[in-house]
Interface confidence: medium
Amino acid sequence: HPICEVSKVASHLEVNCDKRNLTALPPDLPKDTTILHLSENLLYTFSLATLMPYTRLTQLNLDRCELTKLQVDGTLPVLGTLDLSHNQLQSLPLLGQTLPALTVLDVSFNRLTSLPLGALRGLGELQELYLKGNELKTLPPGLLTPTPKLEKLSLANNNLTELPAGLLNGLENLDTLLLQENSLYTIPKGFFGSHLLPFAFLHGNPWLCNCEILYFRRWLQDNAENVYVWKQGVDVKAMTSNVASVQCDNSDKFPVYKYPGKGCPTLGDEGDTDLYDYYPEEDTEGDKVRATRTVVKFPTKAHTTPWGLFYSWSTASLDSQMPSSLHPTQESTKEQTTFPPRWTPNFTLHMESITFSKTPKSTTEPTPSPTTSEPVPEPAPNMTTLEPTPSPTTPEPTSEPAPSPTTPEPTSEPAPSPTTPEPTSEPAPSPTTPEPTPIPTIATSPTILVSATSLITPKSTFLTTTKPVSLLESTKKTIPELDQPPKLRGVLQGHLESSRNDPFLHPDFCCLLPL
């Protein structure tokens, strides 16, 4: 070829047009070109349709071409690798229809400030996504839902302040996650799921070490050998395993995995960290066993309601919904009680999957679940285990997505300790046994009567309690279209000694209703 260098590599015909001061695709390239290098040219704009005659094209390098616009038209049915790195792209084109076979997409070192909803839709074969060195502040919900085969994800060196809770849902093949050098201050509970992640880069973020960080701390402790730091010197580029590279920004660079968590809410006297553990299912690695926690799993679907779009987040732990040292009959000191941010639930209730029965039915003894003890050094309290449901998937975002839940800034007046008001003259129905049951101690599960007489808007993150009524009544008041309470769909199984008398296993005390 008069302009480009042509060579054969195995069954591939490689055409090298690098550094030729090209402003457009050179004419008359071999029709059976499979690898095309157009790096370091002055293309400014480029249309993928110009490559349609090259039906065997599997790899296209357009890096360092001063690209400000990539026109996405036509189809390149077998293109597997697209390198758009080191350009000037301000938005990511929707590539799914044009590049259905794409396995590697590199858009590192561009000027992306956000990604559109459905940015990766149609890229079901994608295995590697490189977005390092852009200006991303947030990620859209469900970004990676269309890419279940993803193995490597780089979001390093952006301006990310938070991550969507379900970002990694369904990514069973993910082995490399690069999040270093962002503005991340916390990791959402349950973010990593339960599958092994051999390579994680998390250093260079301003991690805020408070009670919200305890899930992340526990994950770091359990995955210390998989946390790496990327070191780049004059002559050496290397990665080394170093969990201490993940450091508290507010505590003199103290390693997050050693953060003591003093003063964080606890469940009785049984240790302050198990309250924050979240592993969705029992996970055995070698001889290390992780115990299943008290986890409620909700189908992750967006529900349109009269009050707007609800997102029922994929997982929530009952453990984290139980405030510490809260006696079931403690008197309210204020007419309105506000739960402080650290107890703010991170999910909305999926009404179709919960039950409230007006007339208590007699139930058989629940089948005890086997108790698995937490690995030392932190013993787990004896907890109720709900029957796990299949792992949910992140929803495809709708045209009107719900805002990502954020933890509110504390107000100038500190929120009072949560208290439960005295029962009114119309108490909640007692359990099915004829004799009155004793009030359980806080070591088991407390009876928490929380009224929700007015539904809180999705933007609000504080749960406000007013005059107490039974949970059932408040549910009926707040959901007008429910003439009858929904029927119980799940069976609660537990291994508490007093499971029959445990109010948390009673239908009318099934779940705290945070909205």
């Epitope: 195995a10 069954s11 790899q59 690798t81 790195s85 590192s108 590697e128 780089s154 390579f199 990327w230």
Partner: nanobody, 125 residues
Framework: EVQLVESGGGLVQAGGSLRLSCAAA????????MGWYRQAPGKQRELVAI??????????DSVKGRFTISRDNAKNTKNTVYLQMNSLKPEDTAVYYC????????????????WGQGTQVTVSS
């Protein structure tokens, strides 16, 4: 700089076998193609065998049926390539070089190509 570490060379009698291996550091997470080239004294460097990320392979005519190239598929050792050399002949004597192409790393780096230092294979008659 992508470093490739080769091993397995040595002295062997004609008709014998050797297995060469070449590993790139784990920090280079994605390598499009890995292969082996050789250079005999006073001759040009020539392709012996190459394997692409999709498993496609190619061999020099002179080694077809005797040499086999393979690539480790385990997650943490994906960047390792092997050359099994059977029925070795004196004319296979050369310095064997590992080559990697289309390399992406955890630092966001991209390298078009990298070479190992070479390992000596000597076949005596």
């Amino acid at each position: 700089e992508v470093q490739l570490v080769e091993s397995g060379g040595g002295l062997v009698q004609a008709g014998g076998s050797l297995r060469l291996s070449c590993a790139a550091a784990a920090s280079w997470f994605s390598i499009y193609a890995m292969g082996w080239y050789r250079q005999a004294p006073g001759k040009q460097r020539e392709l012996v065998a190459i394997i692409l990320s999709d498993g496609d392979t190619d061999y020099a005519d002179s080694v077809k049926g005797r040499f086999t190239i393979s690539r480790d598929n385990a997650k943490n050792t994906k960047n390792t390539v092997y050359l099994q050399m059977n029925s070795l002949k004196p004319e296979d004597t050369a310095v064997y070089y590992c080559n990697a192409r289309g390399i992406r790393g955890s630092g966001g780096d991209y390298a078009r190509e990298a070479w190992g230092q070479g390992t000596q294979v000597t076949v005596s008659s």
